[in-house]
């Protein structure tokens, strides 16, 4: 349309913006690698990262992995989005007992309530069969079909663990606060994953859980607490801090209860492959100090030589004349220099090679 | 927070060459080590080159003799030029200011620009 003609030259004429004439209207240019969430974006905010298929983008807006439902106790839930994760739970007939980001570490089979006992609350994928006794007058073979539910087909009575106490003796069948049995959190404790939090004797709809204080009933101001060198993660689960007892790292932040240990490399040392709160590869940090001239800045940097020289000798860290955009050139690597010396005086992981490479000496 | 802008990126076959700049007004650039990370799709954030302010320079083995860094301190810009690129050079590539006191964690893409997408297709 004529009456276009000048809008649309004016849009023309902003390198960030570009003309859309399905829509007639100025639009936002996304930056190189975004996307546009819409036909015709108006700002930064409608740009987005696109993902490969099977990964979304996260809250830091990284491509992170959906995690997968293909084991056979788990079924998908929620599929994987662009910006959110594929969840899974535990297939019909089962109950999570260790729960993980999106998905569940362990599934069990609903329980069976026992002879005397009837079924208070039927089983879900979150939670197992809560059992009740029976009232009085009621026989075991149930007066109400209701109260006699027979788990889905395919099920088999969760098997009962070693009582874990003499206190505990009769918690197979005793309910205990709210219905929820002792032996359930026995059992996921005796199959719980190693290293995870343990909630035996603590009863709690999250294993690993506990208020920081007792709570007035119908309180919700109880913050959940988990165990030591576990933290509260944003969907409110116990998640295990890193460790940074690696020899090449050192605790930048500390666990908190609801934030993870944050490691980094220790100093002369620069992250080369990143991991989440940590680095899963260090590497000695591979250019001279300007100012340290020829003498190295610690030993870490010592280590980091461009060509390996004779054991006990100091690296040449003269810097080369600069003129304006200073390039490149080819560089020796340092692979040599991290097997023969570095390793001698460097706790570096072996788990990963090294690759090291420097130049402009 | 300091930010810095990266540009250059695009899809590219397999062979063919980019070349990103990584720049800022926010501060003078000969001072500090500069430093290109990459992060493809799924994976952890991984280094790519450093070049100090007087110009020497270091690379991972993986691009070693096929990018090239370089800094022009008077215009504030961090170049790295990709020759020969390949398939699994496919990545979003970040800028980062002085890795040697700050990419000690693996924090060090998307902090402080939002990076440039290379994308290779063989």
């Known amino acids: 349309f004529p009456q276009d003609r000048p809008f649309e030259d004016t849009c023309r004429g902003n390198p960030g913006h570009y003309y859309d004439k399905a829509v007639r209207r100025c639009c936002y240019r996304c930056p190189t690698g975004l996307f546009p969430t819409q036909q015709c974006p108006q700002r930064p905010a409608d740009c987005r990262k696109q993902c490969e298929p099977d990964y979304y983008l996260d809250e830091a807006g990284r491509c992170t992995a959906c995690v997968s439902c293909s084991r056979d106790d788990l079924v998908e839930k929620m599929p994987c989005a662009w910006n959110s994760s594929r969840v899974c739970e535990c297939q019909p007939g089962m109950f999570c007992a260790v729960s993980v980001v999106n998905s569940c570490a362990r599934c069990f089979f609903h329980s069976v309530c026992p002879a005397g006992m009837i079924v208070k609350f039927p089983g879900t994928a979150q939670k197992n069969t809560v059992c009740e006794p029976a009232s009085p007058g009621v026989s075991p073979a149930c007066a109400s079909p209701e109260n006699c539910k027979e788990p889905s087909s395919g099920t088999i009575p969760q098997a009962k663990p070693t009582p874990v106490s003499p206190a505990t003796s009769n918690a197979s069948t005793m309910p205990l606060r709210g219905g929820t049995r002792l032996a359930q959190e026995a059992a996921s404790k005796l199959t719980r994953a190693p290293g995870s939090p343990s909630s035996v004797g603590r009863p709690s709809s999250d294993p690993g859980l506990s208020p920081t204080q007792p709570c007035p009933q119908g309180s919700g101001d109880c913050r959940k607490q988990c165990e030591p060198d576990y933290y509260l993660d944003e969907a409110g689960r116990c998640t295990a801090c890193v460790s940074c007892s690696r020899d090449d790292l050192v605790e930048k932040t500390p666990c908190a209860w609801n934030s993870s240990r944050i490691c980094e490399c220790r100093p002369g040392m620069i992250c080369a492959t990143s991991a989440t709160n940590s680095c899963a590869r260090c590497v000695p940090y591979p250019i001279c100090a300007a100012e340290t001239g020829t003498k190295p800045q610690d030993m870490a940097e010592k280590d980091t030589t461009f060509e390996a020289p004779p054991v006990g000798t100091q690296p040449d860290c003269s810097p080369t004349p600069e003129n304006g955009e200073a390039p490149a050139s080819t560089s020796p690597t340092l692979s040599s220099l991290v097997d023969s010396q570095a390793s001698k005086t460097l706790p570096i992981p072996t788990s990963a090679p090294i690759a090291l490479s420097s130049t402009g000496k | 927070q300091m930010q810095l802008v990266e540009s250059g990126g695009g899809s590219v076959q397999a062979g063919e060459t980019l070349r990103l700049s990584c720049t800022t007004s926010a501060f003078t650039f000969d001072g500090p080590d500069m430093a290109w990370y990459r992060q493809a799709p799924g994976n952890e954030c991984v280094l790519v080159s450093i070049?100090?302010?007087?110009?020497?320079?270091y690379y991972a083995d993986s691009v070693k003799g096929r990018f090239t860094i370089s800094r022009d301190n008077a215009k504030n810009t961090v170049f790295l030029n990709l020759n020969s690129l390949q398939p699994e050079d496919t990545a979003v590539y970040y800028c980062?200011?002085?890795?040697?006191?700050?990419?000690?964690?693996?924090?060090?893409?998307?902090?402080w620009g939002p990076g440039t997408q290379v994308t290779v297709s063989s």
């Open positions: 980062a200011l002085d890795p040697r006191k700050n990419c000690r964690g693996g924090y060090c893409c998307a902090n």
């Open positions: 070049i100090s302010a007087d110009g020497r320079t």
